[in-house]
Interface confidence: low
Amino acid sequence: IIGGSMDAKGSFPWQAKMISRHGLTTGATLISDQWLLTTAKNLFLNHSETASAKDITPTLTLYVGKNQLVEIEKVVLHPNHSVVDIGLIKLKQRVLVTERVMPICLPSKDYIAPGRVGYVSGWGRNANFRFTDRLKYVMLPVADQDKCVVHYENSTVPEKKNLTSPVGVQPILNEHTFCAGLTKYQEDTCYGDAGSAFAIHDMEEDTWYAAGILSFDKSCAVAEYGVYVRATDLKDWVQETMAKN
Amino acid sequence: IIGGSMDAKGSFPWQAKMISRHGLTTGATLISDQWLLTTAKNLFLNHSETASAKDITPTLTLYVGKNQLVEIEKVVLHPNHSVVDIGLIKLKQRVLVTERVMPICLPSKDYIAPGRVGYVSGWGRNANFRFTDRLKYVMLPVADQDKCVVHYENSTVPEKKNLTSPVGVQPILNEHTFCAGLTKYQEDTCYGDAGSAFAIHDMEEDTWYAAGILSFDKSCAVAEYGVYVRATDLKDWVQETMAKN
Amino acid sequence: VELGNDAMDFEDDSCPKPPEIANGYVEHLVRYRCRQFYRLRAEGDGVYTLNDEKQWVNTVAGEKLPECEAVCGKPKHPVDQVQ
Amino acid sequence: VELGNDAMDFEDDSCPKPPEIANGYVEHLVRYRCRQFYRLRAEGDGVYTLNDEKQWVNTVAGEKLPECEAVCGKPKHPVDQVQ
């Protein structure tokens, strides 16, 4: 997280830290006491594109709460993970839910609207481009989708598109994604924050929902927008996968 | 009971049979699992007017249900029993309430209105002037009080009153009493039915209430009306007596 | 933190016999509860009684037990939100 | 006629330990009931729980037990009433 604040109180108990092959820090989000969401890209870090979920599983290390190591049983990639940058992680044992470790809810309704504010926590790189040793969070507004597409692809018109990412890496942008950021204080997400939730507080229900999962964490206040996978598009697949496995 | 029907099913489980001194059959009504109402006149049968409750108690024999003998601990006469022809009987042990033995409720509201029908069961004399050996019952309408007073006392005007009972015995008639009978089939109560309840079924509550206790059982389809003590006038005294004893 | 008497330990698998009342009897019940941060998911009301075979059964769920499922999205110390 | 499991006999003063559920616990209760033709008169709701001293107590009535009082005016076989 570039800028933002330290999570002193443990306000993001769904936030997990995943160490990928060769020691890269990434994010994951607890969505039940035995399952987490992360990005497919996180899972494939330092693996070839042909790697299977079985190959990936033993290469991951996962921590929840205050550095509590949890064992992974299996990884399930989204069947269309090149378009929907998502994977599920199943733990060997259910975690004990406490004030430090608690899943975030998946939404039934769509909370995404331009200007709506969400909170993104993460273990990713900070303004010094170092991985943070204390969990941080930032408050980011949902962006206008067309502006985001123009920012990264020059145009919303297919034939006029070309790759214009200010950070030289292109996000996956489609109907399953939304964009958020940047704040006026130049606060943003950065490398290693992917897999974290775009958390929205439903005031009426007093409940926090993961409206999205950060997929493109390369903006780092250089590009203007982080890109997130819409959680409403995941819910059916998630529930089906959890029930089957 | 003159006419009426046999109680084949045990529909009057509050009905008790009391044998007074020298073997006369009378009625009593179970109002809790340890107390019964009867008439003061029943209690004084074959006793002098100066007899005390203590004198009367050992001379009585009491049966409930299907000839189940129960032991009497004490008798309590109404403090004004020459006007309110009532006494209470306390049993030595609580009876076990079953389908054959069950108290009737005392009413909080006044069910007595001319034409309203009640059921009177009894072990008293039948059309042959013999005591019945099977419990019988009759359905009787509440009478117009003025007609009843005229029937037994010639007039409702005090100075015009004289004793005109068709059966040569005068009932106690006052503000604590009501009259009921006769049916068009010449059905009536008779000697030995006194102490039995004028039972009214409250359809809303599906509960049977003793709206009155038969005091004057000498009509026997010769005179037109049986006379009953109003239960609403007894409730406070009954509850107080039961609590004290 | 559970209450002592709710989370009590039935060391000897027995509960003391409750006093008898005249013309009455007792029905033994257990009510399932969940620890903090969990909520009960049950087909019935979470209350179970002993049947003739001395099995704990619920009128709706039968012998099927309730579950304590993790609460989601209810952080104990939520972030201070800027209005 | 009472149901067997309502009027059951706790011969050995014990009730079998109910199954445990993950992240949950059980609260032991007894509910006082009355035999047929009696009804419960209680300061509380007739449900008693074991306190730390293993006494059966009701939250309202404390250790005071309910009573079964005779039902009145509810004959099992009422007279066939002519409408």
């Epitope: 009426e204 007093d206 | - | 509860r33 903090q36 209810k74 104990k76 | -």
Partner: antibody, heavy 121, light 108 residues
Framework: EVHLLESGGGLVQPGGSLRLSCQAS????????MSWVRRAPGKGLEWISS????????YTADSVKGRFTISRDNSKNTLYLQMNSLRAEDTAAYYC??????????????WGQGTTVTVSS | DIQMTQSPSTLSASVGDRVTITCRAS??????LAWYQQKPGKAPKLLIY???SLESEVPSRFSGSGSGTEFTLTISSLQPDDFATYYC??????????FGQGTNLEIK
């Protein structure tokens, strides 16, 4: 604006019954737990009953259990309290309250103005 | 059941004073404690939940602290509008909800 409006209070004789209603507006009623709380004259606040967004979750104070029943009609955005066998000690101002949380165990963030119940012969 | 004991029962203070009300639980309730304010003829108003979280639109002069069995409500600088009765309340999934007996804050 979030608003709760109670009705149905009044004078009733001991042993009688009343049904209180609470009309909710300004929030998603069917996602919220709701409660009834009362305050007797000269006494403190006393919780009566709570009902979850899912009506399986109902909790009732022992002092009224068996006499009072909480219910809700989400289609009408209305909370109810059916009060039977009323006693003199049930005389109080009755408040309907919205739980902060969607579950049945949380603090109450919004309260109605209250309706008065008087039990007297 | 949990018993909540509030002290003092009555508190006399002046505008500008710093006042503290204490609430003790008969057993640990973690941070599941709320504070309410009630004025005569009015509905109670939530001030603090989860022992120390300030309800929205409640002035910052109100603060709560504590966990386990000991809790306090502090008003840093008493305003004329603050004279009322204050209640603490324990709540969590182990119902019933238990209120303190109330503290009447009156003008000295």
């Amino acid at each position: 604006e979030v608003h709760l409006l109670e009705s149905g209070g009044g004078l009733v004789q001991p042993g009688g019954s009343l049904r209180l209603s609470c009309q909710a507006s300004g929030f998603t009623f069917n996602s919220n737990a709701m409660s009834w709380v009362r305050r007797a004259p000269g006494k403190g606040l006393e919780w009566i009953s709570s009902i979850g967004a899912n009506t399986n979750y109902i909790y009732t104070a022992d002092s009224v259990k068996g006499r009072f029943t909480i219910s809700r009609d989400n289609s009408k955005n209305t909370l109810y309290l059916q009060m039977n066998s009323l006693r003199a000690e049930d005389t109080a101002a009755y408040y309907c309250a919205k739980n902060r949380d969607r579950y049945s165990y949380d603090a109450w963030s919004v309260w109605g103005q209250g309706t008065t119940v008087t039990v007297s012969s | 059941d949990i018993q909540m004991t509030q002290s003092p029962s009555t508190l006399s203070a002046s505008v500008g004073d710093r006042v503290t009300i204490t609430c003790r639980a008969s057993q640990s309730i973690d941070i599941w404690l709320a504070w309410y304010q009630q004025k005569p003829g009015k509905a109670p108003k939530l001030l603090i939940y989860e022992a120390s979280s300030l309800e929205s639109e409640v002035p910052s002069r109100f603060s709560g602290s504590g966990s386990g069995t000991e809790f306090t409500l502090t008003i840093s600088s008493l305003q004329p509008d603050d004279f009322a009765t204050y209640y603490c309340q324990a709540y969590n999934s182990n119902y019933p909800y238990a209120f303190g007996q109330g503290t009447n804050l009156e003008i000295k």
